[in-house]
């Protein structure tokens, strides 16, 4: 069997074949968060479990200090779910009282940091108004998409309010990425 | 063209190259569910269409008796969407009446069963309080993430209430997995 | 190193190996939409950014006239998120007035068009009733799944109401596909 038989007619010579099993991959799961003071319009980053339970990193994809570090340039599928829970939003009361009715909201952002670039890049955002009539509410926001990343890029998940993140179960709040 | 030229410098020798087209894959779609009695705190599993319409299984990924059977160890991306619909939650009425206000909820869980392990493992959970003021409500819960699975593992989708699942369209409620 | 050593025992000879880097891929991001007249029960298609910012198409995956054109048969993962925003639904008022209470809704459909087939195929649908008590609301609908597509198939994203789509940020509303 000649090597040529593995290569479809549109094979680029500069794109070597590689085993799928050695591609950088990570699935991180929620842990209790440290409450943080954060500036207005600057969402705090979540930190993650990277080795216990369902969580793992492999093939040079490393987790450190709230960041997933991209070890190799290429196209990655990146995903996260954050489950939020909270008390009743003041929304309906505000409305009845006739005060300005800006609904509360919950937001998740997957952010890319490139050391050579001064500003972080928001890759994905899920944002939802919360205006519940029940006393306790809970709901997930899910995000996922493909991006071209460079070796050394760092990924993090930011949220609008850390205190509303459900940290209790590894299947409710998670963050992952894999090289395609 | 020598075979060596296909292998990047970090290629592990124990990770053979393989054609993408022969990887285990499945996309299952909703069918009408059989109402089931289930114990408290034990969510019923959905069953699925596996060969008609948009649904398929291929490359030794088989569907049987509500389970997707994993034919080969590796990292899989697993996903599901369940669309729920129902009548008005009692939530707002309960609140007004001053009774304890525990909101209704809808929940989807993707569960892994390993024969050698006594307890199923919850891989992914999407859970949402439902406290609607309109008479009829409907909404999807989407989940997706990557997990390391072993040959022989079984995957299923459990829901909090089968009677609320929208089984009318194959594009509204579905379940899939593919080897990365 | 003989070529045979790259092939696992279940390798099909008709499935050639190919470099991951040359697979068709696209991630499209939102742009301001042109309001369109559309027939009842026929949802308008969104158009997209395909080359600026986070958006790209590569390896013969082309975008033209609201469609992603599939250049090669195979199994694709397809995803989209649409963020909607609007004013208060009339839902609670309708309910109080005792009129028929059909809630407003928001819907996203990922549709496949095959030239040889007269009717488009709905691959994925996310639909949600909207019955908010706050004055302004916003929320995303996310979809993603795997489908077997044929060379020449075209993909588009349809929504129930273009005027409710949040076109302000490329991370809020997007559409992508990649060959597995």
């Amino acid at each position: 069997l000649k090597g040529q038989e593995f290569a479809p007619s549109h094979q680029q010579v500069y794109a070597p074949l590689r085993a799928d099993g050695d591609k950088p991959r990570a699935h991180l799961t929620v842990v209790r968060q440290t409450p943080t003071q954060h500036f207005k319009n600057q969402f705090p980053a979540l930190h993650w479990e990277h080795e216990l339970g369902l969580a793992f990193t492999k093939n040079r994809m490393n987790y450190t200090n709230k960041f997933l570090l991209i070890p190799e340039s290429g196209d990655y599928f990146i995903y996260s779910q954050v489950t939020f829970r909270g008390m009743t939003s003041e929304c309906s009361e505000i409305r009845q009282a006739g005060r300005p009715n800006k609904p509360d909201s919950i937001t998740v952002v997957i952010t890319k940091v490139t050391d050579s670039y001064p500003e972080p890049t928001q890759l994905l955002m899920g944002t939802k108004s919360v205006c519940e009539v029940g006393s306790n509410w809970f709901q997930p926001i899910y995000l996922g998409a493909m991006f071209s990343l460079q070796e050394g890029d760092k990924l993090m998940v930011n949220v609008s309010d850390i205190s509303l993140v459900d940290y209790t179960k590894e299947d409710k709040t998670f963050f992952g990425a894999f090289l395609l | 063209l020598k075979g060596q030229e296909f292998a990047p410098s970090h290629q592990q020798v124990y990770a053979p190259l393989r054609a993408d087209g022969d990887k285990p894959r499945a996309h299952l779609t909703v069918v009408r569910q059989t109402p089931t009695q289930h114990f408290k705190n034990q969510f019923p599993a959905l069953h699925w269409e596996h060969e008609l319409g948009l649904a398929f299984t291929k490359n030794r990924m088989n569907y049987t008796n509500k389970f997707l059977l994993i034919p080969e160890s590796g990292d899989y991306f697993i996903y599901s969407q369940v669309t729920f619909r129902g009548m008005t939650s009692e939530c707002s009425e309960i609140r007004q009446a001053g009774r304890p206000n525990k909101p209704d909820s809808i929940t989807v869980v993707i569960t892994k069963v390993t024969d050698s392990y006594p307890e199923p493992t919850q891989l992914l959970m999407g859970t949402k309080s439902v406290c609607e003021v309109g008479s009829n409500w409907f909404q999807p819960i989407y989940l997706g993430a990557m997990f390391s699975l072993q040959e022989g593992d079984k995957l299923m989708v459990n829901v909090s209430d089968i009677s609320l699942v929208d089984y009318t369209k194959e594009d509204k409620t579905f379940f899939g997995a593919f080897l990365l | 190193l003989k070529g045979q050593e790259f092939a696992p025992s279940h390798q099909q000879v008709y499935a050639p190996l190919r470099a991951d880097g040359d697979k068709p891929r696209a991630h499209l991001t939102v742009v301001r939409q042109t309001p369109t007249q559309h027939f009842k029960n026929q949802f308008p298609a969104l158009h997209w950014e395909h080359e600026l910012g986070l958006a790209f198409t590569k390896n013969r995956m082309n975008y033209t006239n609201k469609f992603l054109l599939i250049p090669e048969s195979g199994d694709y993962f397809i995803y989209s998120q649409v963020t909607f925003r609007g004013m208060t639904s009339e839902c609670s008022e309708i309910r109080q007035a005792g009129r028929p209470n059909k809630p407003d809704s928001i819907t996203v459909v990922i549709t496949k068009v095959t030239d040889s087939y007269p009717e488009p195929t709905q691959l994925l649908m996310g639909t949600k009733s909207v019955c908010e008590v706050g004055s302004n609301w916003f929320q995303p609908i996310y979809l993603g799944a795997m489908f077997s597509l044929q060379e020449g198939d075209k993909l588009m994203v349809n929504v129930s109401d273009i005027s409710l789509v949040d076109y302000t940020k490329e991370d809020k509303t997007f559409f992508g596909a990649f060959l597995l």
């Epitope: 209790t168 179960k169 | 705190n41 | -």
Partner: antibody, heavy 118, light 109 residues
Framework: QEQLQQWGAGLLKPSETLSLTCAVY??????YYWSWIRQPPGKGLEWI?????????NYNPSLKSRVTISVDTSKNQFSLKLSSVTAADTAVYYC????????????WDQGTMVTVSS | DIQMTQSPSSLSASVGDRVTITCRAS??????LNWYQQKPGKAPKLLIY???SLQSGVPSRFSGSGSGTDFTLTISSLQPEDFATYYC???????????FGQGTKLEIK
């Protein structure tokens, strides 16, 4: 309704290792963090540390060098070991469940009195 | 370390009285404050979490308020079963930990 029940030695000599185990009955184990808290006679409450279903731990910095908390998910149990005990470790030891709202402990066991005396 | 100071350390009141116990943190803890009731020989019981949320099953005469550094627990109308020791507890610390106030003993006048 979930219940917690603990057991372990109630009388120790200085320099020995305190060992307690707490079992969770009648509910979910995986969805919570599980803590140990102690209360010396006539004094206030002191949080010792916690563990979750996966085995991730957080400890009170003042006790961290002597504390190990572990989990056995197959039995729905978690355990406390406190090494090199002294008379200052004499206390009622409680196991408790974090409700999911940042160290708000909604279920407690009845407590075990542990005395350290030579 | 964040220090929690409760006041008063003890107080006497009568059935039907309105009682307020305060808790002050040495630095801002946002709303990360819980209140517990403990009776002699018993485990503590959670009353209020996240500063103002009433735990399920706790009578509505108990309420909590405050954010930042100053918090209060109020019992609107004392009942005989309310005589006990009350503890506040913060959960804002970094590294992740929690700490309790020294307690307020509520006695019958």
């Amino acid at each position: 309704q979930e219940q917690l029940q603990q057991w372990g030695a109630g009388l120790l000599k200085p320099s020995e290792t305190l060992s307690l185990t707490c079992a969770v009955y009648g509910g979910s184990f995986s969805g919570y963090y599980w803590s140990w808290i102690r209360q010396p006679p006539g004094k206030g409450l002191e949080w010792i540390g916690e563990i979750n279903h996966s085995g991730r731990t957080n400890y009170n910095p003042s006790l961290k060098s002597r504390v190990t908390i572990s989990v056995d998910t197959s039995k729905n149990q978690f355990s406390l070991k406190l090494s090199s005990v002294t008379a200052a470790d004499t206390a009622v030891y409680y196991c408790a469940r974090d409700s999911g709202w940042h160290f708000s402990f909604d279920i407690w066991d009845q407590g075990t009195m542990v005395t350290v005396s030579s | 370390d964040i220090q929690m100071t409760q006041s008063p350390s003890s107080l006497s009141a009568s059935v039907g009285d309105r009682v307020t116990i305060t808790c002050r943190a040495s630095q801002s803890i946002s709303s990360y404050l819980n209140w517990y009731q403990q009776k002699p020989g018993k485990a503590p019981k959670l009353l209020i979490y996240v500063a103002s949320s009433l735990q399920s099953g706790v009578p509505s005469r108990f309420s909590g308020s405050g954010s930042g550094t100053d918090f209060t627990l109020t019992i609107s109308s004392l009942q005989p079963e309310d005589f006990a020791t009350y503890y506040c507890q913060q959960s804002y610390s970094n590294p992740q930990e929690c700490s309790f106030g020294q307690g307020t003993k509520l006695e019958i006048k």
